[in-house]
Amino acid sequence: NKILVKQSPMLVAYDNAVNLSCKYSYNLFSREFRASLHKGLDSAVEVCVVYGNYSQQLQVYSKTGFNCDGKLGNESVTFYLQNLYVNQTDIYFCKIEVMYPPPYLDNEKSNGTIIHVKGKHLCPSPLFPGPSKP
Amino acid sequence: NKILVKQSPMLVAYDNAVNLSCKYSYNLFSREFRASLHKGLDSAVEVCVVYGNYSQQLQVYSKTGFNCDGKLGNESVTFYLQNLYVNQTDIYFCKIEVMYPPPYLDNEKSNGTIIHVKGKHLCPSPLFPGPSKP
C-alpha cells in the first residue's frame, strides 16, 4: 500500500521564498515519519527533511545548504524555503516515509511542483549610479 | 511496445530561446509520425507539433501561440523555441506517435525537461535615467 501525495503544480517565488505544502492520504498523528523535499527530475538533491516523532519535537534540517523550515498538519507537511536563488528554479518532489508503528509505508512518486524563483532583480538607482572612474 | 524518450533534465533559456532535443528509441526514417512538445505537469498545453511524412516536407506548427521550429534526425526531433516569456518557465514533455506503417506506436511518458526562461532583465542606463518630474 502506498501513500498518495498532492502538491501544487507550480509555485512562483517572487521574493526568493516559497511555502510548498505536501498533502498526504495518511494521518501522521502519533506516527514516526520522515518527510523530505527533493530537487530535480532525478530527485538527486535532498533539500529539506522534517522528522516527526510522537514523543519529541519536530526536527527540521537541511544537509544541502537550503534555508528551510517545516510545519506539520495531520495529513500534511509544509516546507518553507527562504533565500532561494534564481538558478534553483526546478521541480521539487515531496516524499514521505512512515517508519513506526509498522508496517513501513512510503509514497507513490508525486507529480512534483515547479518552483520558479523570480528573485529580485535590482537595478542601480539612476540618481546614484555608483562609483565611476575619475 | 512503447517508444522510450530521453530529454535533458534542465535547460536554461538565457536569451528567451532554447533547443530541446527529444531522443527516441525508434528510427523515424520513412515513417509517418507526429512529434509534439507539451507544457506543464499535466501536459495541458501542446506547445509545438512536428508532423513527418516520408513523402512530404516536415510540417512544424503551434496552435498555442509559441514561436517554434523543428528539426528531424533519424531517432530524434529537436524543437527550437523562441520569444519565450519568463513566466513560461515550466516542465516540457516530449511525445511521439508513429502512425504508419502499422502498428501504431507511442511513447512511455518521459521525465520531462525543466525550461527555465531567464530572459533579459534590462536596467535603464545610469547616464540616461529617463524622464523625471519637474
Epitope: 516515509e97 508503528p101 509498522p102 | -
Partner: antibody, heavy 120, light 111 residues
C-alpha cells in the same frame, strides 16, 4: 539463500573509531520490503539495538548512541556499514547485523557477529 | 522508550517439562490488531534466532513445541515439552516504536 556476514572487528583503542561491514547476499539492500539493523551484545549481557537503514537509505538510530554512530551502505557491493566514534570500554561487544521485513519488523536473518574489544 | 521486562531471569527445567516465559511491556505494543512483539532464542557463541513473530506466529522451520500468546502489554512464550537443544537464553523484542528494545533475557538451564 539469505546471508549476512559481518567483518571489521578487533581491538580498538579508547577514543578511537570502528567501521564494521555487513555483506548481504540473497537479497538486495536497496529493494523495497526489507531493511537492516545493527545490534550489539556486551559480554554476558543482553541485546541492544543500535540503529537501522531502510531500502530508501533513510536511517534511524538509538537515542543513546545517535551522536556517535553512522549507518551507511554501498549498493554496488550490497554491503552495509557501521561507524562508531569516540569508543569507550563499554562499547566492547559482539556486533550483529540483522535483516527485517517491513511488515512486522522482526529480525528473521542474523549475521554471525563480529567482536570489538575497546582497550588500551 | 518502551521497556520490556522478562520473568523469570533464569529457570532450571528438565527435558520434557513445560516451560513458560513472560514478557511485560511498559506500554501497549499493539497496532491495528497486531502485536509487534517477537521472541528469539540464543545459544552461547551464536547469533539469536527468530522463533515467534507478531506475538503468536511461528517462524518457518521452528518446531511446533514453541508457541507464543498475549496482546497489549503481556506476552508469553511457551515450550510445551522441553528438548535438550532448547537450553538457551530467550529474548522478547518490540518493534512498535523506535528505539527497538529487547527484554533482558531468560536463561533456561538444565535441572
Amino acid at each position: 539463500e539469505v546471508q549476512l556476514v559481518e567483518s571489521g572487528g578487533g581491538l580498538v583503542q579508547p577514543g578511537g573509531s570502528l567501521r564494521l561491514s555487513c555483506a548481504a547476499s540473497g537479497f538486495s539492500l536497496s529493494t523495497g520490503g526489507v531493511g537492516v539493523s545493527w545490534i550489539r551484545q556486551a559480554p554476558g549481557k543482553g541485546l541492544e539495538w543500535i540503529g537501522e537503514i531502510y531500502h530508501s537509505g533513510s536511517t534511524y538510530y538509538s537515542p543513546s548512541l545517535k551522536s556517535r554512530v553512522t549507518i551507511s551502505r554501498d549498493n554496488s557491493k550490497n554491503t552495509l556499514y557501521l561507524q562508531l566514534n569516540s569508543l569507550r570500554a563499554e562499547d566492547t561487544a559482539v556486533y550483529y547485523c540483522a535483516r527485517y521485513e517491513y511488515y512486522y519488523y522482526d529480525f528473521d536473518y542474523w549475521g554471525q557477529g563480529t567482536l570489538v574489544t575497546v582497550s588500551s | 522508550d518502551i521497556q520490556l521486562t522478562q520473568s523469570p531471569s533464569s529457570l532450571s527445567a528438565s527435558v520434557g517439562d513445560r516451560v513458560t516465559i513472560t514478557c511485560r511491556a511498559s506500554q501497549s505494543v499493539d497496532f491495528h490488531g497486531i502485536s509487534f512483539l517477537h521472541w528469539y532464542q540464543q545459544k552461547p557463541g551464536k547469533a539469536p534466532k527468530l522463533l515467534i513473530y507478531a506475538a503468536s506466529s511461528l517462524q518457518s522451520g521452528v518446531p511446533s513445541r514453541f508457541s507464543g500468546s498475549g496482546s497489549g502489554t503481556d506476552f508469553t512464550l511457551t515450550i510445551s515439552s522441553l528438548q535438550p537443544e532448547d537450553f538457551a537464553t530467550y529474548y522478547c523484542q518490540q518493534s512498535y516504536r523506535s528505539p527497538r528494545t529487547f527484554g533482558q533475557g531468560t536463561k533456561v538451564e538444565i535441572k
